[in-house]
Interface confidence: medium
Amino acid sequence: HTAAQDNCTCPTNKMTVCSPDGPGGRCQCRALGSGMAVDCSTLTSKCLLLKARMSAPKNARTLVRPSEHALVDNDGLYDPDCDPEGRFKARQCNQTSVCWCVNSVGVRRTDKGDLSLRCDELVRTHHILIDLRHRPTAGAFNHSDLDAELRRLFRERYRLHPKFVAAVHYEQPTIQIELRQNTSQKAAGDVDIGDAAYYFERDIKGESLFQGRGGLDLRVRGEPLQVERTLIYYLDEIPPKFSMKRLT
């Protein structure tokens, strides 16, 4: 089943238009903005989700130190170009012909240029560090309980294979979730860590992309875990290329 048959909706992406016009009257769902058919049994790619979002009406340290090459998405929202598989095209341009290269999660990895800018390949983001700060609680969460709950969440809600959750670090009130997935490790059908991280980010912000599943309610041994700040760092298989001006 690609979508819920009876009422013809997409459980994993509410930013779709669905109708029973697939083969044999099957429910088929298309992403808003791009009109591309989506597989509703798994996560929709971040590129298609961003495109849909732009088309929608406007409304002693154990913690990991992000590497000098880590990217943070400071550019915010843009209307991306996606390839036929729903992945980000390596080069993105805006309406004023300003262009830049992005990684597989759609984050800019070069200085901005003009239409002559070349982006030879889509560079894979193989390591994502999700840095969360939780609201004050009566006491610290038990690290192993927190670890188990976050791993379970990524497996159940985002369908990310447990092997891609490399580590969960905790130093109250900071939680860090490390996702790692090399090109060679990602098999057909595996959820991409970039897509899982994006769904998680939207869930944390109270903007769930799931249909009919309620918002994210994160608990550790029944105790609500409320996030007050999120930072996501992206590490690419090939370091980004920025001018010295950008780095200072």
Partner: antibody
Framework: QIQLVQSGHEVKKPGASVKVSCKAS????????MNWVRQAPGQGLEWMGW????????TYAEEFKGRFVFSLETSASTAYLQISSLKAEDMAMYFC??????????????WGQGTTVTVSS | DIQMTQSPSSLSASVGDRVTITCKAS??????VAWYQQKPGKAPKVLIY???YRYTGVPDRFSGSGSGTDFTFTISSLQPEDIAVYYC?????????FGGGTKVEIK
Amino acid sequence: QIQLVQSGHEVKKPGASVKVSCKASGYTFTNYGMNWVRQAPGQGLEWMGWINTKTGEPTYAEEFKGRFVFSLETSASTAYLQISSLKAEDMAMYFCGRGGYGSSYWYFDVWGQGTTVTVSS
Amino acid sequence: DIQMTQSPSSLSASVGDRVTITCKASQDVSIAVAWYQQKPGKAPKVLIYSASYRYTGVPDRFSGSGSGTDFTFTISSLQPEDIAVYYCQQHYITPLTFGGGTKVEIK
């Protein structure tokens, strides 16, 4: 300890109304959603829907839209199920069950003891 | 709605036997399946959630596995107190749905 205590068994005539209560104790009432589940005699379990204890917003399964109403008395940590225009097929055991707001917690870890509603003329 | 097809509907086994119940979802529900035990005249009790996570205080003879559409619940060594009806439930998407139940009896 954490528990849900439901009101006593009810015997009603067809066309009448009934209101079943579910009183929570031992936890923060508004931290968890409250679900209602029906079990007809000798039958399985049917999810009727749930009520968001933070906002009071009810969600009903398709089959339970219309004559069934979920409500709250938050100050008393109590959820209610009201059934109007009772029919013979409403005769069942009704359970309340504690669940969460997100998909990860849509299973029920605490249940009321059940309230039997008998419809007989 | 997602249909949960549970089998068998009843079974009879001896004390100490390994008992297996299966549940098939009509569409992919990730690992969002719970298993409950219900004794006559009582409310159900959750044993397993998220396919394989044992709920607090549940004996380790109860286990669960599976993902996608196929799920299994196992009692590794049946005890007299395990006589009950067992239900699976998908907790992936609303409306939440239960399997038809499996009645477990002692031979």
